[in-house]
Amino acid sequence: AMHVAQPAVVLASSRGIASFVCEYASPGKATEVRVTVLRQADSQVTEVCAATYMMGNELTFLDDSICTGTSSGNQVNLTIQGLRAMDTGLYICKVELMYPPPYYLGIGNGTQIYVIDPEPCPDSDF
């Protein structure tokens, strides 16, 4: 499988936004690339979001996706929003070179995203 690199740990912002870079070493001259973010919890794997893009073009996720991203060469900058403490977990970047053949697939080791819910503001008496 293709080599895919991603940071080991990322801390989400107080607004529940986490960003990380997913970088892959392409063996060939792919024109169509698919990037998928998977969340692994114990033995369960769920798809968080996915986008297919043409090399040189922008990465487009579905309108209702919690992910956004930009691409530059063999690097994809991913942002996941709307995260809450319960979403803390291992987020895996999966990259597939879809076209032209041959098909290549790579799986990153995962980024542990920590999300801390903000403390509610105390009521003020003024």
């Epitope: 499988a1 070493a25 063996p27 001259k29 041959p102 098909y103 290549y104």
Partner: antibody, heavy 115, light 108 residues
Framework: EVQLVESGGGLVQPGRSLRLSCTAS????????MNWVRQAPGKGLEWVAQ??????????YYSDSVKGRFTISRDDSKSIAYLQMNSLKTEDTAVYYC??????WGQGTTVTVSS | DIQMTQSPSSLSASVGDRVTITCGAS??????LNWYQQKPGKSPKLLIY???NLADGMPSRFSGSGSGRDYTLTISSLQPEDVATYYC??????????FGGGTKVEIK
């Protein structure tokens, strides 16, 4: 049209050597990780070896059953992959397929190891 | 090493039947799975790549699904030309890139 043509198979005695060749055409050979997969008579498919391409420093991988006996190599200038098979055993008897990525397959060449 | 367990090892179905073949990995493989079709006396052909993508030139009655450890190949309406042995293969590093044991599909 994509073509992978294997050659070099035949009948060989146990302990002897054989070199298989895989000549590719119709696709960009240098973009492909090349594999050898074998199939013993009446049995399933067994992955044997893989050689990656230049961006991956021509890394090689082998199944445990052939490690230390078989060597995979490639010549990108000729679009040929090779499988050097030494110390052959009767259990190496099989049809050997060459594959480009896992997308393209050759027609196979038969290797029979028998005394 | 990750083991690939395919079932059934053989099946016989009627033309037009829906046929399902399963492949289970001993560990999570994140959709890193291909399916191949091998007709009698022929070389294998790539059928499905990346668990769900239909290879060029393959009929749309074939589909792949699954995630995690469990994967399925489905033939929505079996045709006489689908008589073959079907193999799954794990394509996730590290090696070996193990094949399942195969499923021989015949027509009743």
């Amino acid at each position: 049209e994509v073509q992978l043509v294997e050659s070099g198979g035949g009948l060989v005695q146990p302990g002897r050597s054989l070199r298989l060749s895989c000549t590719a055409s119709g696709f960009t050979f240098s973009d492909n990780w090349m594999n050898w997969v074998r199939q013993a008579p009446g049995k399933g498919l067994e992955w044997v070896a893989q050689i990656r391409n230049k961006p991956y420093n021509y890394e090689t991988y082998y199944s445990d059953s052939v490690k230390g006996r078989f060597t995979i190599s490639r010549d990108d200038s000729k679009s040929i992959a090779y499988l050097q098979m030494n110390s052959l055993k009767t259990e190496d008897t099989a049809v050997y397929y060459c594959t480009g990525g896992m997308d393209y397959w050759g027609q196979g060449t038969t290797v029979t190891v028998s005394s | 090493d990750i083991q690939m367990t395919q079932s059934p090892s053989s099946l016989s179905a009627s033309v037009g039947d829906r046929v399902t073949i399963t492949c289970g990995a001993s560990e999570i493989i994140y959709g890193a799975l291909n399916w191949y079709q091998q007709k009698p006396g022929k070389s294998p052909k790539l059928l499905i790549y990346g668990a769900t993508n239909l290879a060029d030139g393959m009929p749309s009655r074939f589909s792949g699904s699954g995630s995690g450890r469990d994967y399925t190949l489905t033939i929505s309406s079996l045709q006489p030309e689908d008589v073959a042995t079907y193999y799954c293969q794990k394509i996730l590093s590290p090696p070996p890139w193990t094949f399942g044991g195969g499923t021989k599909v015949e027509i009743k």
